[in-house]
């Protein structure tokens, strides 16, 4: 009888009696900007605080009549949803709520931004344990917004927000879009994209996963045992700000990068029918829903790697595309994708102290997508290798030449706009364990890491006959750092990486042009994190069919 | 996730010598101006006035007051409705969109954005 | 488990009091409220009243209020409805039962048979 | 206070038959309805929260739906053990209140 939505996300393993409190003695709080809320309800009452905080726009119409019940509605059933004591995910969690939005629902971004604020003040006031801000809600694009998400990231708060209930990119909402934000997109109980009358969940590379937010049951303001369902992306951030409580319940010190990362890696993949999205959204949409993770010291030493992908590049001849890990992240490899096949590669490069990822378009292109690897390594020490472009008919290669650095990622870029000039560049291992080989007129670069215990090999699979796609993927224990595509006589669009997968993807017109001997291959990086051991490098595995 | 989506940029670099001001004539605008793409969603006549990062909390206080100032010459009533002091700096202000091209040029602007609804979702 | 546990019976005299206890186990006593029912011989149910154990707070059916209060004892996880002044009228089986704000009254004690004779 | 009203007090019926009981509240009452049976000599127990939710290991012969005042309890396909006293609840406000009860009686 335990709601779908609770036995969805926390595993079996988890699951705890009724009502006790999460684990640990850590005092998280969790502050919900949203509409006013029914503190007395028996789901909630003791475990939250109504603040003060009241920043909202008037009712629009005349003769709005405002009814207590209609007005806490949305506030109540996320506070519900995050701290019930039934049908919550983080049953003991505190909750201070704070009203941003109105009777309608609606609020402003100025109104938001102040009630940023009135947590950074409360939080230096008086400094407490780990703090989650929940932001069910979403207006256009805002870069101050955003900003002030970043300013609040970085004081050690996490933040979690609803993509947006309009069918559409998220990329194109506030706080939703704002990197430093953990961005949740809605499923049903099938594991699919919820539809809302005629739209639905956003979607996109600004959302990190997807969590239940259909039909969600939760404390109703109706009365104070009432219980309602409600659907949107608001539930399913509810669901998610209840998983990182639990998470720094247990663990108090977990950080945003590492919190994510886990919440990424744990989730379930691959159930999302990607077909409801927009075809130019699917590959940049991740396949993940929400679960609770183990705690670290079940499941310590991992290496933890996401893709992020950058905005679209434009079309314009020298358009390019960024990248960009957060802070704490390392970025191990860099790649590039195309629709149209026409780029001139990927390269990493320093901005303002950060490596970042860039893809540069081509003549003709319609545009690029830079594709970072960024994964969290302790106590790691990276660098970028680069090799010019060799002279016309020559190979270029570069490895890394650091004692004890092994390879992670290799990225092409080709000073050449004409595509038929050059054959595309390649990764070989064979030759030498751990270097890049780029073709003529390809610069060079490689990603080379050091840090305890860490272990590379390179895995390649080559397809000969017709295909749109070649993939490989890491075993078990072993965590995808790179990925590139090694051509046979096709023209390839990219490649990228999809959790522990690499994929290489093709120009499906020249599929019927390949001879037997020109495989396209997908190689990828698999690396490993062992605690006792020196980083090493790994003669590498590789097949053909 | 960082770069701007589908959003309103515009460039209000506007003359400013009618003012007769040397201090305001020296400083020419480099700060944008930005609203949200979808007009229904917009609130004009509502602003929130960006500063750059490093600005003092004395300076917030300056330029807000340095705006009101402005605007009385030249006949208009502004009024500051909240002063952002621990998040970023900045301020939040109600006038007429006739002052944006002033307010643009202010020391340390880095740029406005017009207020606009969030909604529940 | 999630137990509540009553005395089966009570015999008491007209005009005296009683007090019924009601020992939860299994679960944190003082996060579900507990209500108390009353159900007289081929009658139905009768809601008597409920009281927070976290806080002591009470809610009374206003038929009661001058018949039952409601007290617990945190450390030793119980309840206690105590019963005034009882006539003929008050003999009937008094159940406690444990409520939580989704799942309703979830769990019941076997309740207490009180017969009021002299 | 809400009135709950359970129209039959009792209902006759065959082992396989469908059954419906009908609760009525005396004002809107949202989903706040709970339904309780009582076998002979035993305590209430508890089938259906939030008027149309199955408690933890109760069969799902046994459903509730409804909500403001019309509510409806249904077993699809009668068994022997089914022979008991259902009650109706509201847990809309206090005091809680609980319909007469209907005694289901097997042919």
């Known amino acids: 009888s335990i709601p779908w939505n609770l036995e969805r996300i926390i595993p079996a393993w988890h699951q705890t009696e009724e009502d006790r409190s999460p684990d640990g003695s850590s005092q998280v709080e969790v502050y919900l900007l949203d509409t006013s809320i029914q503190g007395a309800h028996r789901e909630i009452e003791g475990r939250v605080t109504i603040t003060d905080f009241n920043s909202v726009p008037e009712e629009d119409g005349t003769r709005f009549h405002r009814q207590a019940s209609k007005c806490d509605s949305h506030g109540t059933h996320l506070a519900g949803v995050v701290s019930g004591r039934d049908a919550g995910v983080a049953k003991g969690t505190s909750l201070h709520s704070l009203r941003v939005l109105n009777c309608q629902g609606k609020g402003t971004v100025s109104g938001t931004l102040i009630g940023l604020e009135f947590i950074r003040k409360s939080q230096l006031i008086q400094p407490s344990g780990p703090l989650v801000v929940l932001l069910p809600l979403a207006g256009g694009y805002s870069r101050i917004l955003n900003a002030a998400c970043r300013h609040l990231a970085r004081t050690g708060v996490v933040l979690v927000a609803a993509a947006g209930n309009f069918r559409d990119d998220a990329c194109l909402y506030s706080p939703a879009s704002a990197p430093e934000v953990i961005t949740v997109g809605a499923t049903n109980a099938q594991d699919q994209p919820v539809t809302l009358g005629t739209l639905g969940t956003n979607f996109g590379r600004c959302v990190d996963l997807f969590a239940p937010g259909k039909d969600i049951i939760g404390a109703s303001s109706d009365c104070s045992t009432c219980f309602m369902s409600q659907s949107g992306t608001s539930q399913a951030a509810a669901h998610v700000a209840g998983i990182v409580a639990r998470m720094l319940s247990r663990e108090p010190t977990l950080t945003l990068a590492e919190l994510r990362q886990r919440l990424i890696h744990f989730s379930t993949k691959d159930v999302i029918n990607m077909a409801w999205f927009p075809e130019d959204q699917q590959v940049l949409t991740p396949n993940l829903v929400a679960t609770l993770p183990p705690s670290t010291h079940e499941t310590g030493g991992q290496l933890l790697c996401r893709t992020v992908w950058s905005a679209h590049s434009g079309p314009t001849r020298t358009a390019t595309a960024t990248a960009r890990c957060a802070p704490e992240e390392e970025l191990l490899s860099c790649s590039s994708f195309s629709r149209s096949g026409r780029r001139r590669g990927d390269w990493i490069e320093a901005i303002g102290g950060q490596q970042v990822c860039k893809a540069l378009n081509a003549f003709g292109g319609e545009g690029v997508y830079a594709v970072a690897r960024c994964c969290l390594v302790p106590r790691a020490n990276c660098s970028i290798h680069n090799t010019p472009a060799a002279r016309a008919g020559l190979e270029t290669h570069v490895h890394c030449h650091q004692k004890d650095h092994v390879l992670t990622g290799c990225s092409f870029h080709w000073e050449v706009e004409d595509l038929s000039v050059r054959r595309q560049p390649a990764l070989r291992s064979r030759r030498q364990p751990g270097q890049c080989v780029g073709h003529q007129a390809a610069s060079v670069y490689a990603s080379c890491c050091h840090a305890p215990g860490l272990e590379c090999k390179i895995k390649e699979h080559g397809i000969s006959g017709p295909s749109e796609q070649v993939t490989v993927a890491c075993e078990a224990g072993w965590t995808l750092t790179g990925c590139n595509v090694l051509p046979g006589a096709s023209l390839t669009l990219g490649a990228y990486s999809v959790d522990n997968l690499c994929v290489a993807r093709v120009h499906d017109t020249a599929r019927a042009d390949r001879t037997s001997g020109e495989a396209t291959v997908a190689a990828a990086i698999c690396c490993r994190s062992r605690p006792s051991a020196k980083a090493s490098w790994v003669q590498h595995h590789h097949h053909h069919h | 996730q960082d770069e701007d989506g589908d959003y309103e940029e515009l460039m209000l670099a506007l003359p400013s010598q009618e003012d007769g001001l040397a201090d305001e004539a020296a400083h020419v605008a480099t700060a944008t101006f930005r609203r949200c793409s979808k007009e229904a969603w917009r609130l004009p006549g509502t602003y929130i006035v960006v500063l750059m990062e490093e600005t003092q909390r004395l300076q917030i206080e300056q330029t807000a007051h340095r705006l009101q100032t402005r605007a009385a010459r030249r006949g208009y009533v502004i009024k500051v409705l909240h002063i952002f002091y621990d998040l970023f700096p900045g301020f939040l202000v109600k006038m007429s969109s006739d002052l944006l091209g002033l307010a643009l040029k202010l020391p340390h602007v880095e740029y406005i954005e017009e207020d606009s609804f969030v909604f529940a979702q | 488990q999630v137990q509540l546990q009553q005395p089966g019976a009570e015999l008491v005299k007209p005009g005296a009091s009683v007090k019924l206890s009601c020992k939860a186990s299994?679960?944190?006593?003082?996060?579900?409220?507990m209500h108390w029912v009353k159900q007289r011989p081929g009658q139905g149910l009768e809601w008597i009243g409920e009281?927070?154990?976290?806080?002591?707070?009470?809610n009374y059916n206003e038929k009661f209020k001058s018949k039952a209060t409601l007290t617990v004892d945190k450390s030793s996880s119980t309840a206690y409805m105590q019963l005034s002044s009882l006539t003929s009228e008050d003999s009937a089986v008094y159940y406690c039962?444990?409520?939580?704000?989704?799942?309703?009254?979830?769990?019941w004690g076997q309740g207490t048979s009180v017969t009021v004779s002299s | 206070d809400i009135v709950m009203t359970q129209s039959h007090k009792f209902m006759s019926t065959s082992v396989g038959d469908r059954v419906s009981i009908t609760c009525k509240a005396s004002?809107?009452?949202?989903?706040?309805v709970a339904w309780y049976q009582q076998k002979p000599g035993q305590s209430p127990k508890l089938l259906i929260y939030?008027?149309?939710y199955r408690y933890t290991g109760v069969p799902d012969r046994f459903t509730g739906s409804g909500s403001g005042t019309d509510f409806t309890f249904t077993i699809s396909s009668v068994q022997a053990e089914d022979l008991a006293v259902y009650y109706c609840?509201?847990?809309?406000?206090?005091?809680?209140?609980f319909g007469g009860g209907t005694k289901l009686e097997i042919k």
């Open positions: 004002q809107d009452v949202s989903t706040a």
């Open positions: 939030s008027a149309s």
């Open positions: 299994g679960y944190t006593f003082t996060s579900y409220w």
């Open positions: 609840q509201q847990r809309y406000s206090t005091p809680r209140t």
């Open positions: 009281i927070n154990p976290s806080n002591g707070r009470t």
């Open positions: 039962a444990r409520e939580r704000p989704l799942y309703a009254m979830d769990y």
